[in-house]
Structures are given as structure tokens and as C-alpha cells.
């Protein structure tokens, strides 16, 4: 099943996707579409690249902010709304018949939490997962204890049982954090 990402209304959502150009600099077209990856191409294209640059974008809210020329084609959706929720397809269009790499990612947009996160929750999260907290858009930041959690990404590895993930996800929802579950 697709990896799930949670973002608050009004925040930026980050949906990761990447490939390794071979040889380096030999870029391939990529499309991002709303909806699970279909057999061919992308449905409901929100952004498309060619071998050089982004050449089609349905809204100014969709951006590739990573190092596109090194294969980082992660999608940033700015100022998300509830309507942005759903499955997105990142399709890396490798030349040849049926060679495309297809990645489905699920974005869940939630309403901003009204409750200020408890300090104990912050400390517990930081000590439990010291290397999994990220404060930037593009991957792990240095280990730190954040003063607040509105823009934190947390990766929960799949060895946790579903109950733990469910509980943690609900706690984070209440705290207004952003969570990635792998």
C-alpha cells in the first residue's frame, strides 16, 4: 500500500520521489498526477518535467524544490487545503516498454490542531526517535528537541505494531505535527 503523509491545512506538503539518473545528468521525464498511478502516463497531471526542466504545472502551488538535476523530483504542494487530500502518483518515465517507475503516495490533509502540544510528548518523541525528526522539507535535520511541533516530519518504521502507529498518529494529529509512516 502507498506511504502516507500528513500535512495541516495552510502548511506545505512534501511528497518524496527520486531516482538516480544514469549516467549522472541524463534526466528522464517525470509526471506527478492526482490519483493512483494508472497503466499509462499520469492521470490528472499536476506537474510534468521533460529532460531539462518543469514544462507543465497546473497550479503555482506545485513545485519541485529539490535538486531536480540529481533526480530529486519530490513534490511540494504549497498552502494545502482539505481538497488536496488523496493519492498522488509520481511516475518516472524511463524509456522503453513498461519501464516506468511508479510510486503512489497518499496525502492526508488535516485541520490545524487547536491544542498546544504537551512538553512531555515532545520530549518523549525526541528521545524515542532521535534521528527521525526533520524540520526542513528535504530530509532529516540534526537531532534536536524542538520547541514546538507544527512543521516536524516524523518517520515511523514499519516494525512498530499497528496499534502503536495508530496511537502515535493520533497524538501527532492532536499536536499539529506532520507525520510520515513508512
Amino acid at each position: 500500500s502507498e506511504v502516507e503523509y500528513i500535512a495541516e491545512v495552510g502548511q506545505n506538503a512534501y511528497l518524496p520521489c527520486s531516482y538516480t539518473p544514469a549516467p549522472p545528468g541524463n534526466l528522464v521525464p517525470v509526471c506527478w498526477g492526482k490519483g493512483a498511478c494508472p497503466v499509462f502516463d499520469c492521470s490528472n497531471v499536476v506537474l510534468r518535467t521533460d529532460n531539462r526542466d518543469v514544462n507543465d504545472r497546473t497550479s503555482g502551488r506545485y513545485w519541485l524544490k529539490g535538486d531536480f538535476h540529481k533526480g530529486d523530483v519530490s513534490l511540494t504542494i504549497e498552502n494545502v487545503t482539505l481538497a488536496d487530500s488523496g493519492v498522488y502518483c509520481c511516475r518516472i518515465q524511463i524509456p522503453g516498454i513498461m519501464n516506468d517507475e511508479k510510486h503512489n503516495v497518499k496525502l492526508v490533509v488535516i485541520k490545524p490542531a487547536k491544542v498546544t502540544p504537551a512538553p512531555t510528548l515532545q520530549r518523549d518523541l525526541t528521545s524515542a526517535f532521535p534521528r527521525m525528526l526533520t524540520t526542513g522539507e528535504h530530509g532529516p535535520a540534526e537531532t534536536q528537541t524542538p520547541g514546538s511541533l507544527p512543521d516536524v516530519n516524523l518517520t515511523v518504521s514499519n516494525f512498530f505494531c499497528e496499534l502503536q502507529i495508530f496511537t502515535l498518529t493520533n497524538e501527532l494529529r492532536d499536536s499539529g505535527a506532520t507525520i510520515r509512516t513508512a
Epitope: G35, A36, D41, V87, I97
Partner: antibody, heavy 116, light 107 residues
Amino acid sequence: EVQLVESGGDLVQPGGSLRLSCAASGFTFSTYWMTWVRQAPGRGLEWVANIKQDGSAKYYVDSVKGRFTLSRDDAKNSLYLQMNSLRAEDTAVYYCARGSNWFDYWGQGTLVTVSS
Amino acid sequence: ETVMTQSPATLSVSPGERATLSCRANQNVYSNLAWYQQKPGQAPRLLIYDASTRATGFPARFSGSGSGTEFTLTISSLQSEDFAVYYCQQYNNWPLTFGGGTKVEIK
């Protein structure tokens, strides 16, 4: 107005060949995937083949692989289906349609009958 | 391949009544599903795509729902022009496949 007009259907003997054409108008042909779908008499629909915008990729259902060849001529706004080694089970109305995954415009179809 | 099963094969309905058509996939197709309407002697017309998005030219009495393996096409109040054959088609898995169709006929 989008229009797709197929031609080339005929009665042909088993083992014979036919070339179907689809003339497109009313849209920018070169920017769309194009598809052939067929429908045997009194039966349902079957996807046959499709071709990417630039012609760089073509896909075929297993039952026609190696026998049918899809091509396009963007200068003429035309789609073609070369059908060789025809079999009785290829008898159908062949529709040209616009799109890759789902098909928003269809032609009226051309009937291919394979019979001795 | 993904097998699409439509039921019932024939649906007899009086004008003004509600019609509910079912389409089932034997594996997950997410929301990558389309519905087509075909009248005798005519080409199919795209009715619904992405499981629930109505295509241009069709009124609001047509609605699609479902995801995964179970899908429904609902016609809230059948009009005379709605009597036709309806096909579902999945575009999530190779190859693209259609259901066998449901014929909606006048009761």
C-alpha cells in the same frame, strides 16, 4: 469540435492484411495518446493498442502482439493500425479513441470481417 | 489480467426509477475506473472517469462511486435517453480491461 473518423475496414480472408486509418480533427493531435479499441459483433469492448504522443512507445494486447502495428503521422493528424495474419477472432468493429487510460472521444468505428 | 465483472447483465427499470449498476474487479484498481455508455449502433461515450468524475455532457443524475475493487454507477431517475449498455473499464493494471456490460432496458 473533436472528430475521429475511421476507415479501411473490409472483408478479408484469414491470414490476410488490412490497414485501418483514423483521421483526427478539432484538437491538437500531437499532444494526445491515441488508442484502438475493438468490439466483436454482439460482444463487449476490448482494448487493442495505444501509442504515446511522440510515437516513442506503443503497447499491444497480447492477442495481437507481433501481428498488428500501430503508427501515427502527426503532420497528417492520422493514426494507423496495420493488421497482418488476421484471424476469425479479429472480426470486430474497430474504434479509434483519444486518450491513454480512459477515452474521452471515440470515432464511429470501422468493421473488419475475417472470413473465408 | 484484471477481470472486471458487471452485474446484473440486464437491468429492467421503469422511467423515473433509480438504477444501480455494479462493477467488481478481482484485484485493487484504486479509483482508476471509467464508465461508458453505449447505445445501439453508436460508439461508446465516456460517462465517468476516476471512479466518480462525471464527463462533459452528462447530467448530474449520473454518479459513480467506489474504490479498490467495488464500484457503482447510479442513475438517480432514469430518462428515456438513458436506456443503453454501460461498461466499466479499469486502467490501473496491465492490460486495460472492460467489464462485460450491463444493459439497462425499459421495464
